[in-house]
């Protein structure tokens, strides 16, 4: 059964900036990846992110940069400074679709003890 | 404007073979997943085949598990489903129908469909 | 496999009343969930996708909404090309599923 995983960074160097790493471990062909926050995208959450392998990268504030790291995961910088800006115990969720199995999520947030700089 | 048109269906005798052709055109066929979906006289929607848009990746139910193959040719723009064995149980309607990555793969284009009757 | 129930299976309705249509699915879906019309002779339609989602061109009166497992359509005044078979579709997993479709017919 493909999986999903998911990292949540706090940058070391901006306190308030975080970077979201999420991968698909699994034999199909990655299709879309949609990264929200607050919950799964068809759970209440906000989409941060839309990430497709041919048609390219949509994100809305606060995202500043998503890319793809290899075919099958990607990441997520966020932007530290603002009213919509992410606090220490936000969920992050990351779905990818795949075809024809169809799609798998996971969601993390920033571990309470974590220091900055250290993966969750 | 997307059209897909449906060709290839007819009658046919329990045991026999058809091979039905769907033309793509006014959009990149290439970069679309791609799907078969027949309605059975007085039933329900069915989604009997699909295909990755690489060709890489297929999809069947069960019930044509081993009797149909799904294919394209992404240089002609054309999609194909190869049915052998056919049984009584297979006489529908057949579309060709075109799967949308951000719409989570709901179908956005169908063809008018081709007839497929299996009767001695 | 996910099997998606819809009800009821028919509806006698007037023109100009207000319609929902209900759709459950066997285990969640998340928001992987269209809803599709189709009339005799025609290929199906999309409407919505993504739940609520309005495909282009489909008029405002129709409109999606639901989470997880339970999903309805709702058309606000049924126009008289409004009557025909309407199926919910979830292409979450493998094996994508349709429901047995709700047909809408005059009264």
């Known amino acids: 059964t493909p999986e999903v995983w998911v990292q949540v960074r706090m940058e070391a160097t901006e306190l308030s900036s975080f970077t979201i790493r999420c991968g698909f471990l699994g034999s199909g062909s990655i299709s879309l990846v949609t990264v929200s926050w607050g919950g799964p995208n068809g759970a209440g959450g906000t989409t941060l992110a839309v990430l497709h392998p041919e048609r390219g990268i949509r994100q809305w504030a606060p995202a500043r940069q998503a890319r793809w790291e290899t075919q099958s995961s990607i990441s997520l910088i966020l932007e530290g400074s603002g009213a919509s800006s992410p606090c220490a115990n936000t969920t992050f969720c990351c779905k990818f679709a795949s075809f024809p199995e169809g799609s798998w999520e996971a969601c993390g947030s920033l571990p309470p003890s974590s220091d900055p700089g250290l993966s969750a | 404007e997307v059209q897909l048109v449906e060709s290839g269906g007819g009658l046919v005798q329990p045991g026999g073979s058809l091979r039905l052709s769907c033309a793509a055109s006014?959009?990149?066929?290439?970069?679309?997943?791609m799907s078969w979906v027949r309605q059975a006289p007085g039933k329900g929607l069915e989604l009997v085949a699909a295909?990755?848009?690489?060709?890489?990746?297929?999809y069947y139910p069960d019930t044509v598990k081993g009797r149909f193959t799904i294919s394209r040719d992404n240089a002609k723009n054309s999609l194909y489903l190869q049915m052998n064995s056919l049984r009584a149980e297979d006489t529908a309607v057949y579309y060709c129908?075109?799967?949308?990555?951000?719409?989570?793969?709901?179908?956005?284009?169908w063809g008018q469909g081709t007839l497929v009757t299996v009767s001695s | 496999e996910i099997v998606m129930t819809q009800s009821p299976p028919t509806l006698s309705l007037s023109p100009g009343e207000r319609v929902t249509l209900s759709c459950k699915a066997s285990?969640?879906?998340?928001?992987?969930v269209a809803w599709y019309q189709e009339k005799p002779g025609q290929a199906p339609r999309l409407l919505i996708y993504?739940?609520?989602h309005r495909f282009t061109g489909i008029p405002a009166r129709f409109s999606g909404s639901g989470s997880g497992t339970d999903f309805t359509l709702t058309i606000s005044s049924l126009q008289p090309e409004d009557f025909a078979v309407y199926y919910c579709?979830?292409?979450?997993?493998?094996?994508?599923?349709f429901g047995q479709g709700t047909k809408l017919e005059i009264k």
């Open positions: 129908s075109r799967h949308e990555d951000y719409f989570g793969f709901a179908m956005d284009s």
């Open positions: 006014g959009f990149t066929f290439s970069s679309y997943h």
């Open positions: 295909i990755s848009r690489d060709g890489d990746s297929t």
């Open positions: 285990q969640s879906v998340s928001n992987d």
């Open positions: 993504y739940v609520s």
């Open positions: 579709h979830q292409a979450y997993r493998s094996p994508w599923t």
